[in-house]
Interface confidence: low
């Protein structure tokens, strides 16, 4: 029974809930190009960190079966059919795999090798290759290679008349919602409808804030446990029900969205999951839901 678990076990189990490993699924058809998104936000333009892509889940260190590697400034290793199609200098290290076959199915590791002990960001992305559909009439492919990066760039105020959404200044949760409304009828929305792509918004937040929220969640859970125990109304409270509390503000956002991995704290948000041609949604979802592919992200300073 949950109420009789030692306090240390409760904390440990809560911590495990907060640090679930992420594995998101992506699909492509044989013969198409597969697109596996991976991003980070350089501390300053050009201040890049090494990144490796490997076939297989992320090991403790480095990448296994490396297919592409960057250093602080350069792509220093790549193999045929694997390349970076995006704006590498601005932190878009998304991997494109050309002309995929069934053998390309599996887990891929994107490892962002942030300086410091055990600071690496690790992303496991599951690629599922489906046999090519045989259709008599030509249909527009859902080519993520083409579709996804289009969301990244708007004409704007960059040094060469280009602005990347990933570098918009001072964006916050309220502005994300506003942005969603402003873009609903825009050309970008039309692109989204055409491509079926999604935009991932990842917001980097100070570790202190996250720690505070995590503590608040733990305190809330303990108070809830105490309340339940004292009222003797709930004899069995499982971790499953704890993890699936209905959406109720920040506590749920922390439970569902914060991933504490090594020393990096991230809230992942999913904006514009395109369900139907003219329906656009802006909502928070946990990165652990494999049915919802991740797209691009904004970064808070």
């Amino acid at each position: 029974m949950f109420s009789h678990l030692p306090f240390d076990c409760v904390l440990l189990l809560l911590l495990l809930l907060l640090t679930r490993s992420s594995e998101v699924e992506y699909r492509a058809e044989v013969g198409q190009n597969a697109y596996l998104p991976c991003f980070y936000t350089p501390a300053a333009p050009g201040n890049l960190v090494p990144v490796c892509w490997g076939k297989g889940a992320c090991p403790v260190f480095e990448c296994g079966n490396v297919v592409l590697r960057t250093d602080e400034r350069d792509v220093n290793y790549w193999t045929s059919r694997y390349w970076l199609n995006g704006d590498f200098r601005k932190g878009d290290v998304s991997l494109t795999i050309e002309n995929v076959t069934l053998a390309d199915s599996g887990i891929y590791c994107c490892r962002i090798q942030i300086p410091g002990i055990m600071n690496d960001e690790k992303f496991n992305l599951k690629l599922v290759i489906k046999p090519a559909k045989v259709t008599p009439a030509p249909t527009r492919q859902r080519d993520f290679t083409a579709a996804f990066p289009r969301m990244l760039t708007t004409r704007g105020h960059g040094p060469a008349e280009t602005q990347t959404l990933g570098s918009l200044p001072d964006i916050n949760l309220t502005q994300i919602s506003t942005l969603a409304n402003e873009l609903r009828d825009s050309r970008l929305a039309n692109d989204l409808r055409d491509s079926g792509a999604t935009i991932r918004i990842g917001i980097y937040i100070g570790a202190g804030i996250c720690a505070g929220l995590a503590l608040a969640l733990i305190f809330g859970a303990l108070i809830f446990k105490w309340y339940s125990h004292s009222k003797e109304k709930i004899q069995n409270l499982s971790l499953i029900s704890l993890a699936n509390l209905p959406p109720s503000g920040l506590a749920n956002a922390v439970a569902e969205g914060i991933r504490s991995e090594e020393n990096i704290y991230t809230i992942e948000e999913n904006v514009y999951e395109v369900e139907e041609p003219n329906e656009y949604y802006c909502y928070v979802s946990s990165r652990q839901q494999p049915s919802q592919p991740l797209g691009c992200r904004f970064a808070m300073p």
């Epitope: 333009p45 890049l48 199609n85 995006g86 990066p149 760039t153 960059g158 040094p159 280009t162």
Partner: antibody, heavy 122, light 111 residues
């Protein structure tokens, strides 16, 4: 063998428009950033702009942004430069160029076409 | 924009001697210790040809007589020894920041 062949140059009147093409062969065009560079007679090189593999990012030198449009057709392995509102100072040899790595736009340009000449005169 | 200033504008060197061309950037073209400065050679009637990339890396097929050095804002192209075939105009170019920019060029002649 990598080949870049520019075409579409010629004589154009001030204020007029012209569309230059660059036909690429010998490499997977759809994987490369591509650039346009121009050179006025007896002058140095001037970078016009670049386009990424799927046309989602196009960077221009600011002074030319309102006059020139860079585009590409990966199915036809062709890069384009649409020139408008041309003036005499746009008279130049126009080169298309390709960087040395196919996934990253910050590299030096290791392949160049022979250029196509544009003369703006009334 | 990053302005690249090449000097000298023209240079006459005897065969077998050393030629040194300088390129100064108005701001650093370095990031994480790597310099995004490149050198090109252009002969009359021909397109530019890449000689050196990222300050000091010799492009494939280019003779070892050509070398590059420098970091941040000051860069040098050295040709040693100069041969008759080296008569051309040499340009530096930075790709650290859009818009990419070229230097004004240095014309190398033989004494």
């Amino acid at each position: 063998e990598v080949k870049l062949l520019e075409s579409g140059g010629g004589l154009v009147q001030p204020g007029g428009s012209l569309k230059l093409s660059c036909a690429a062969s010998g490499f997977d065009f759809s994987r490369y950033w591509m650039s346009w560079v121009r050179q006025a007679p007896g002058k140095g090189l001037e970078w016009i702009g670049e386009i990424n593999p799927d046309s989602s990012t196009i960077n221009y030198t600011p002074s030319l942004k309102d006059k020139f449009i860079i585009s590409r057709d990966n199915a036809k392995n062709t890069l384009f430069l649409q020139m408008s509102k041309v003036r005499s100072e746009d008279t130049a040899l126009y080169y298309c160029a390709r960087p040395s790595y196919d996934g990253y736009y910050g590299y030096a340009m290791d392949y160049w076409g022979q250029g196509t000449s544009v003369t703006v005169s009334s | 924009d990053i302005v690249l200033t090449q000097s000298p504008a023209s240079l006459a060197v005897s065969l077998g001697q050393r030629a040194t061309i300088s390129c100064r950037a108005s701001e650093s073209v370095d990031s994480y210790g790597k310099s995004f400065m490149h050198w090109y050679q252009q002969k009359p009637g021909q397109p530019p040809k890449l000689l050196i990339y990222r300050a000091s890396n010799l492009e494939s097929g280019i003779p070892a007589r050509f070398s590059g050095s420098g970091s941040r804002t000051d860069f040098t192209l050295t040709i040693n020894p100069v041969e008759a075939d080296d008569v051309a105009t040499y340009y530096c170019q930075q790709s650290n920041e859009d818009p990419y920019t070229f230097g004004g060029g240095t014309k190398l002649e033989i004494k």
